[in-house]
């Protein structure tokens, strides 16, 4: 399906295309000799980059900082220095830059202020950079000032104190709404979440906090959960992790109804050295992965129903550090149903999984052809791809990226791997899919850093290297062929690939800085490759391409969660621009329901090998531990629940006995009866 | 074939620090792998003393953390061994070796043939 | 720390008889142990890991048996130059910790 990569070869050669890459190269060099830099991008499709410098000198009683602030408007090609729109202050960089939600154009920055201060001191910008006000705030900021996803206007702050501090009007006046606070949250609806301690701080009431909520603003409040050790949202589920009466396990609850009512998760609980963690969700379902007793630096991930309530066994030691908190848990957004992780084997082997269908079967990624089993495969003619993410990075192992995937580049994984029985410590190459990770081909030779520019009509890489660097590569088909570009004749020490989050622009920021003997100046270049790809892409460049097609002569070839979906796909011997405007188009079709379109419900189970569901032995005529608030006709099953975001119609409908099982329900959860609401005086 | 070689002084006075340098040849350092020291007291058993990755991250044994840095120099395709305020209990045979090729474990596949280092004043 | 016991620590065995050598862990090491083989004045050579699994060029005498906390090294029929000191070593948990050795001697 694919070769072997090949470099400046008569692979596809581009025809001039270094004096066309020559003629769109900027270089930027900043009068600075900061330590350190960091960049953001501000709005979509705007061009505005904010470039923050800081230069920190330790003396022995106070730290001198100086910032400097730079503005772009042209994707990186030009920079201006600013800083005298923040009347040259030092920023603190542990806060970052907080950038608006959307295209609202709006930027904070937090600055230093001296010790004896009454608060803190913020610049705030609402025309994406252009111009700054210095507001000074009543309390000293813990964490970054925290937008609400539906109004750009308000925001929320912790203070040093623990207060919840909330702002309606961009961060020009602030309220205090609460006091002893530990975590605060959005919600929807511009929803305050937040959990309070009651008698002596937030480490010490761990497991006693209180659950608060607030729908306007800090006027009224409602006590939506007690004995709570934390929350967290995640899709349209909130989840509690809550104390038990009895002793010091914990256990989640579940609420669809932001804290109405709360139903307990049917998954085991917890004890005190465990945790929960919520690996990823969506308004359809959550990947929830359960801690294993003990320090083995794996658990269990669990799959959830429509309810986030009921929850399948999905994989098996699943490596997550309770050190670091490392997992590998990796969801592949340019294929629906695809995520990569990695499970701790018994001999502390770790070894790359896949699933394609949202965790309901995982298996190891195939072998990329032509591909040899390194050292760690025992048969050298059997073995597997494994990858390399945050473990591996965690691990100072040479890998300079985690897996890079993007919505708008259909089918395309980029990733660091070994192929063998295991993840190896030899130094890995790059390794690409174009169909979302069925297939996989070595893509470069060695660690990379790498980007997806035009929705992935370029795919561009730098090498990682210790030595300076002044070349980049660059492919125009999904990583076959590549050439190389000499960007700069001075070799710059490589600090970061910078491109618009979205991965549609055509501009790649190469970032880095020259050292002589005494000075470090900071550099970047910035390439565009619209000239590379001269032409907009027509109708005649692109092909269909069934998503997750395993077996072509099958009617169900293509039907993952109970649809197919086509794709139009750019070839790879097309060389033209899809376009900032680019929309992936995708032919969905509905396919015919089976019993794999179905989890089993509440009380439920499918024996190992079977596809029928039945009833648990152990709950015949008993009562069940997990339960569900709210109406009753919740609590009828026939056994079978659709799996949630399954579209599947016709077909196989499994009918069975309607059974009422609100006789078999127990639970001592907060009852929405004791909820009390509250009115902030 | 890999082949590895311990050097340095063999003979150290007390509270002063032992220095071993480990050259490898035959394959290069920064292509990865881990790479240990283990040492062993004159008619005693192996005890392992700690292990690094070519990027520089370590693992000590806990026994010896406060003592010990191990260092890798990927230029010279060699890795090194600093252990301070010897006494003469870390009078031993020192050996450098290669670790396995998965992430996670850590036994010795490949053995430098030891150099002995004697502590006495 | 994991203590690996290995016992016996002396074992006399006469050529092309059967060598069984024991190691014991104070926690389960699952099968995250190693075999190693040490002659006078040598460094040690590497027979087993994974509990099992010979490594390259190990003659096919040798093998390794167990998990968790019982661990067996066979060596089905002895050779001259199987006369040695053999450590088992676990790398299930740091510290790496090695056994104190068998020493098997001619009878």
């Known amino acids: 399906r694919r070769g072997a990569p090949a470099e400046d070869q008569d692979c596809g050669r581009l025809p001039d295309f270094i004096a066309k890459l020559t003629n769109n190269t900027h270089q930027h060099v900043f009068d600075d000799l900061s330590g350190s830099v960091s960049l953001s991008w501000v709005g979509d499709s705007t061009g505005v980059i904010l470039v923050l410098t800081t230069f920190q000198v330790p003396l022995v009683i106070v730290s001198f900082g100086q910032s400097k602030l730079y503005r772009s408007e042209d994707y990186g090609k030009n920079f201006k220095d600013i800083t005298n729109l923040i009347n040259n202050t030092f920023i603190r960089t542990e806060f970052g830059m907080a950038i608006g939600p959307e295209n609202s154009g709006k930027v904070i920055l937090t600055a230093e202020v001296s010790g004896g201060s009454r608060g803190g001191r913020v610049f705030r910008s609402s025309d994406f950079a252009k111009n700054f006000v210095q507001t000074d705030l009543p309390f000293h900021p813990l964490t970054q000032m925290m937008y609400s996803p539906q109004n750009s206007d308000y925001l929320l702050a912790l203070s040093t104190e623990n207060g919840l501090w909330v702002s309606k009007n961009f961060g020009e006046k602030w309220e205090e709404i609460h006091k002893a606070v530990c975590l605060a949250k959005w919600g929807p609806n511009n929803i305050i979440f937040f959990t309070t301690h009651v008698n002596g701080s937030c480490k010490a009431d761990l497991g006693a906090l209180e659950l608060w909520r607030t729908s306007d603003l800090g006027k009224t409040f409602k006590t939506i959960g007690v004995k709570i050790y934390s929350f967290g949202l995640g899709g349209r589920f909130l989840f509690a992790s809550v104390m038990a009466d009895k002793d010091t396990t914990r256990r989640i609850h579940v609420s669809t109804d932001q804290g109405d009512t709360w139903s307990m998760a049917q998954l085991p609980s917890v004890g005190q050295e465990q945790f929960y963690s919520i690996l990823a969700a969506n308004e359809d379902m959550v990947f929830m992965h359960v801690d294993e007793p003990g320090d083995t630096g794996f658990g269990t991930i669990f799959t959830s129903d429509d309810r986030g309530i009921v929850y399948s066994k999905s994989l098996d030691r699943h490596l997550y550090t309770t050190t670091g908190g490392e997992t590998d848990f990796t969801n592949v957004t340019s294929l629906r149903g695809v995520y990569i992780t990695s499970t701790l084997s018994e001999d502390n082997s770790i070894q790359s999984m896949i699933t394609f269908d949202q965790g309901g079967r995982w298996e190891h990624l195939r072998k990329p052809e032509n591909s040899k089993c390194d050292a760690t495969a025992k048969n050298k003619n059997e073995c597997s791809l494994h990858i390399h993410a945050s473990y591996s990075i965690s691990q100072k192992l040479n890998v300079p990226m985690a897996p890079l995937s993007e919505p708008n580049a259909v089918g395309i994984v980029i990733a660091h791997g070994s192929v063998g029985d295991a993840i190896s410590v030899m130094v890995p190459d790059v390794y690409i899919s174009d169909d979302g990770g069925y297939s996989w081909a070595k893509m470069l030779e060695g660690p990379h850093y790498y980007t997806i520019l035009d929705s992935g009509g370029i795919i561009v890489a730098i090498e990682h290297s210790n030595r300076p660097i002044n070349v980049i590569k660059f492919s125009t088909d999904e990583g076959q062929c590549w050439q190389s570009y000499v960007f700069t004749q001075e070799p710059i020490y490589f600090t970061g690939l910078a491109s618009e989050p979205g991965a549609r622009s055509m501009n790649i920021s190469i970032w880095g800085f020259t050292e002589s003997f005494i000075t470090r100046q900071w550099v970047s270049y910035t390439v565009d490759f619209k000239d590379i790809l001269e032409r907009n892409c027509e109708e005649d460049d692109y092909t269909t391409w069934l998503a997750h097609s395993t077996d072509p002569g099958d009617y169900k070839d293509g039907c993952i969660l109970g649809y197919k979906e086509q794709f139009l796909r750019l070839r790879k011997s097309s060389v033209c621009q899809n376009g900032r405007d680019y929309v992936v188009a995708k032919q969905p079709s509905v396919c015919p329901c089976s019993l794999e379109d179905f989890l089993c419900d509440f009380g439920y189970f499918r024996p190992e090998n079977a596809s029928e569901c039945v009833e648990q032995p152990e709950l015949k005529g008993h009562e069940l531990e997990f339960c569900l608030y709210g109406k009753e006709e919740h609590l009828t099953t026939n056994g079978y629940r659709k799996i949630p975001g399954d579209k599947c119609q016709g077909g196989m409908n499994p009918a069975r006995e309607v059974k009422d099982l609100k006789k078999k329900c127990t639970s001592n959860f907060l009852n929405p009866t004791k909820q009390n609401s509250k009115s902030n005086s | 074939q890999v082949q590895l070689q311990e050097s340095g002084p063999g003979l150290v006075k007390p509270s002063e620090t032992l220095s071993l340098t480990c050259a490898v040849s035959?394959?290069?350092?920064?292509?990865?792998?881990?790479w240990g020291w283990i040492r062993q007291p004159p008619g005693k058993g192996l005890e392992w003393i700690g292990s690094?990755?070519?990027?520089?991250?370590?693992y000590y044994n806990p026994s010896l953390k406060s003592r010990v840095t191990i260092s890798v120099d990927t230029s010279k395709n060699q890795f090194s061994l600093k252990l301070s305020s010897v006494t003469a209990a870390d009078t031993a045979v020192y050996y450098c070796a290669r670790g396995p090729p998965e992430l996670g474990k850590m036994y010795f596949q490949h053995w430098g043939q030891g150099t002995l280092v004697t502590v006495s004043s | 720390e994991i203590v690996l016991t290995q016992s016996p620590a002396t074992l006399s065995v006469s050529p092309g008889e059967r060598a069984t050598l024991s190691c014991r862990a104070s926690?389960?090491?699952?099968?995250?142990l190693a075999w190693y083989q040490q002659k006078p004045g040598q460094a040690p050579r590497l027979l087993i890991y994974g509990a099992s699994t010979r490594a390259t060029g190990i003659p096919a005498r040798f093998s390794g048996s167990g998990s968790g906390t019982e661990f067996t090294l066979t060596i089905s029929s002895l050779q001259s130059e199987d006369f040695a000191v053999y450590y088992c070593q676990q790398d299930r948990k740091g510290p790496l910790t090695f056994g104190g050795g068998t020493k098997v001697e001619i009878k």
């Open positions: 690094i990755y070519h990027s520089g991250n370590t």
């Open positions: 035959g394959y290069s350092i920064s292509s990865g792998y881990y």
């Open positions: 926690q389960s090491v699952s099968s995250n």
